[in-house]
């Protein structure tokens, strides 16, 4: 049994880091393998992650972490029984993938303005809370070409757009994702999409 693709990990910079790797053949990840991880810090304890299958030869492990900060560095040991298959390290702050925003809501009762709001996925005491920027994707269910991205570079998790910038009388969907420049993160996954019917009063022709 050998590792074909070494583990690569990303952290949500809050409580979970996800590591994925590939074996050289079909593997029952949960019964045959264990990923041991330990913070390189005084008094830290070793933890064991039981991987799950991710395709025939692929494995994925969700590492639980407390109080993640930029100085943290973890040692990783991948074991198959008594055999050490791979040894490495992981610094969560250098491989951050933020959590996806939640509770995306479209408020259509503001006069001819669409107000989209969502929730910041981090608590106020997490560093990323004040450092997320967002991308909002809006698309038409009727017209695949009607697809747009709005970059939200301010901190407030909301976006206002004139309803007239979208076609009236048809249904739209929206979703939002986040990233943080400070840690050069990747983009988060998209939030679940939300749907609304866009309608607004056309201005009277003179």
């Amino acid at each position: 049994m050998k590792v074909l693709q070494e583990p690569t990990c990303v952290s949500d910079y809050m409580s979970i880091s996800t590591c994925e790797w590939k074996m050289n053949g079909p593997t029952n990840c949960s019964t045959e393998l264990r990923l041991l991880y330990q913070l390189v810090f005084l008094l830290s304890e070793a933890h064991t992650c039981i991987p799950e299958n991710n395709g025939g030869a692929g494995c994925v492990c969700h590492l639980l972490m407390d109080d993640v900060v930029s100085a943290d560095n973890y040692t990783l040991d991948l074991w198959a029984g008594q055999q050490l298959l791979w040894k490495g390290s992981f610094k969560p702050s250098e491989h951050v993938k933020p959590r996806a925003p939640g509770n995306l809501t479209v408020h259509t009762n503001v006069s001819d303005t669409l107000l989209l709001t969502w929730s910041n996925p981090y608590p106020p005491d997490n560093y990323l809370y004040n450092h997320l920027t967002y991308a909002v994707n809006i698309w038409s269910e009727n017209d695949p070409a009607d697809f747009r991205i709005y970059n939200v570079t301010y901190l407030e998790p909301s976006l206002r757009i004139a309803a007239s910038t979208l076609k009236s009388g048809i249904s739209y969907r929206a979703r939002v994702r986040a990233w943080a420049q400070c840690y050069n993160t990747t983009w988060s996954e998209w939030s679940p999409s939300t749907k609304w019917h866009n309608s607004y009063r056309e201005p009277f022709e003179q």
């Epitope: 810090f41 005084l42 008094l43 304890e45 407390d66 109080d67 900060v69 930029s70 100085a71």
Partner: antibody, heavy 116, light 111 residues
């Protein structure tokens, strides 16, 4: 919100021991290390030691080795710092502080006076 | 236990800028991150800066930190009378096991 509530002031005689408590609330107690530091009158801050509330393991500043003992009670989310063989130089305000590499939140402090 | 060196006192007028230095060595500041704490009269210390230059939520951006080599600096702009306090730098040292030295402390007076 996070609160670290420390026990009240103590007056002790030289050679005696003192046990200071720090009750934590507002966060997952076993997820954060707890430091102890002190400040003697007219002096700066001085680190005493650290405890991992999850397993109870501890590490102390060399200066206090053999005289200090840190323990925790997970059922009450409380950490304790006991200092023995007290001398006048141990008169100080003792603080518990939550954190790992740095101290996010501090208790209000417990004044320990050592006097004959 | 290693101690980090700070100036005993600094002073400036309201609205001005002041800097406080913190000098250490290769086994602490040079190899770690620096934090800064404010201790107002009669109060417990409060975290101002961590990770060399990050502010906890609620700390105004008048406070900033930087690090270069084995030294660190806390800068306070737009001084207010409420900033009058003792300031301490802190880090960790792994030269003889892990220890957390603090700076000698700096008394800031707002004139």
């Amino acid at each position: 919100q996070v609160q670290l509530v420390q026990s009240g002031a103590e007056v002790k005689k030289p050679g005696a021991s003192v046990k200071v408590s720090c009750k934590a609330s507002g966060y997952a107690f076993t997820s954060y290390y707890m430091h102890w530091a002190r400040q003697a009158p007219g002096q700066g801050l001085e680190w005493v030691g650290i405890i991992n509330p999850s397993g109870g393991s501890t590490s102390y500043a060399q200066k206090f080795q053999g005289r200090v003992t840190m323990t925790r009670d997970t059922s009450t989310s409380t950490v304790y710092m006991e200092l023995s063989s007290l001398r006048s130089g141990d008169t100080a305000v003792y603080y518990c502080a939550r954190g790992k590499y740095w101290m996010y939140d501090w208790g209000k402090g417990t004044l320990v006076t050592v006097s004959s | 236990q290693a101690v980090l060196t700070q100036p005993p006192s600094v002073s400036a007028a309201p609205g001005q800028k002041v800097t406080i230095s913190c000098s250490g060595g290769s086994s602490n500041i040079g190899n770690s991150y620096v934090s800064w704490y404010q201790r107002l009269p009669g109060a417990a210390p409060k975290l101002l800066i961590y990770d060399n230059n990050k502010r906890p939520s609620g700390i105004p951006d008048r406070f900033s930190g930087s690090k270069s080599g084995t030294s660190a600096t806390l800068a306070i702009t737009g001084l207010q009378t409420g900033d009058e306090a003792d300031y301490y730098c802190g880090t960790w040292d792994t030269s003889t096991g892990w220890e957390w030295p603090f700076g000698t402390g700096t008394k800031l007076t707002v004139l």
